[in-house]
């Protein structure tokens, strides 16, 4: 006899990285017929939704209209069908960004390199932080973590055309409070004579897209929660 229901999916829209004072929606998708959804924040009950009619709804949305450091942290959700509760969802790490200062991102030997060359990114921030994060824009969130008093190194090693793309970095004041993003650095790797454009699985976005930190496309989020659960979120574990 089944004692619990399958765990729901949890994700954030437009993204788990939320600029301070901006709105974010935490989505929890369970099963049709669920009479109650609970959102937990840092282990305590945060919000409850009892959708009506339950048989026509399998996803609820919990809005946070004004993101701040108090609201940053780990969220999970559960749902209930009759008296039977689900397993808890995976943890969603909600990060507040645009805190305090802006780091500087540079690349050595330069932004235009030949395939096979060794490339290192440097992220510098003079305020009190010792953890830095390098993110590559694209369909999935490629994130690296680095440490240093005011600067962290991110060696990419010998690069290939797959490394082409736009990079930004953050300083991290704690796991859930990050700085403003650096200005972007576009890495161009030559060596693929046939095709010098970006790889199709790693598209660039319009310049304003970064404003909402859509490192993963919304359609991608909605279609593949497993991808969402296991990309950039893993860096916070």
């Amino acid at each position: 006899q089944q004692q619990t229901l399958p765990k729901p999916f949890i994700w954030a829209e437009p993204h788990f990285m939320v600029p301070k004072e901006k709105q974010v929606t935490i989505c929890c998708q369970g099963n049709y017929g669920a009479v109650e959804y609970q959102l937990h924040f840092e282990g305590s009950l945060f919000a409850v939704d009892r959708p009506k009619p339950p048989e026509r709804i399998n996803k609820v949305q919990f809005y946070i209209p004004d993101m701040n450091s108090r609201m940053a942290g780990q969220y999970s959700c559960i749902y209930r069908v009759g008296e039977l509760w689900s397993e808890p969802s995976n943890l969603l790490d909600l990060v507040v960004t645009e805190m305090y200062d802006t780091p500087t991102l540079s690349v050595h030997p330069g932004p235009e390199v030949i395939s096979g060359e060794k490339v290192t990114f440097y992220c510098r921030l003079d305020t009190a932080t010792s953890m830095f994060l390098l993110l590559k824009e694209g369909r999935s969130s490629h994130v690296q973590r680095g440490y240093g008093k005011v600067q962290a190194e991110f060696p990419l090693g010998p690069v290939t055309t797959a490394h082409r793309g736009t990079y930004r970095c953050f300083g991290s004041y704690n796991n859930h409070a990050w700085s403003f993003p650096s200005e972007p650095v576009k890495l161009l790797v030559t060596g693929d004579i046939e095709n010098t454009s970006l790889a199709p699985e790693d598209p660039t976005f319009p310049a304003d897209t970064w404003g909402t930190y859509l490192l993963t496309t919304e359609t991608g989020l909605q279609k593949d929660h497993a991808l969402w659960d296991h990309t950039a979120q893993n860096l916070l574990r």
Epitope: Q23, F46, V48, Y63
Partner: nanobody, 130 residues
């Protein structure tokens, strides 16, 4: 912007009743989930009860279940808390609170954590004593 003003507090004997009111100004009141939160002397904030913007969903802290009733009248922009069977440990300043007003909230959602609330009244003191 939402302004909240509580009233109805006072001195009551154990076992007695009180009805708190919270008058709201601002056009968005009828679309905001709300709550009552209290703070006992020398203690931290304690969430009491919450209600969805439609009034159709309510939620109570365990120690208030069966004794307190939260309700709202959106036509009057007013939130209420009916408190029965009051105990000495219910002595506190009671605050009404509303979530931020820039989101399309579900008609059935309630927020059960004080950190979710952006707007707060100045509070009304309830003293339960013989």
């Amino acid at each position: 912007e939402v302004q909240l003003v509580e009233s109805g507090g006072g001195l009551v004997q154990p076992g007695g009743s009180l009805r708190l009111s919270c008058a709201a100004s601002g056009r968005t009141f009828s679309r905001l989930p709300m709550a009552w939160v209290r703070q006992a002397p020398g203690k931290g904030l304690e969430w009491v009860s919450a209600i969805s913007w439609s009034g159709g969903s309510t939620y109570y802290a365990d120690s208030m279940k069966g004794r307190f009733t939260i309700s709202r009248d959106n036509s009057k922009n007013t939130l209420y808390l009916q408190m029965n069977s009051l105990r000495a440990e219910d002595t506190a300043v009671y605050y009404c609170a509303a979530v931020g007003d820039s989101a399309p909230y579900s008609a059935t959602i309630v927020y059960t954590d004080a950190r979710a609330y952006a707007y707060w009244g100045q509070g009304t003191l309830v003293t339960v004593s013989s």
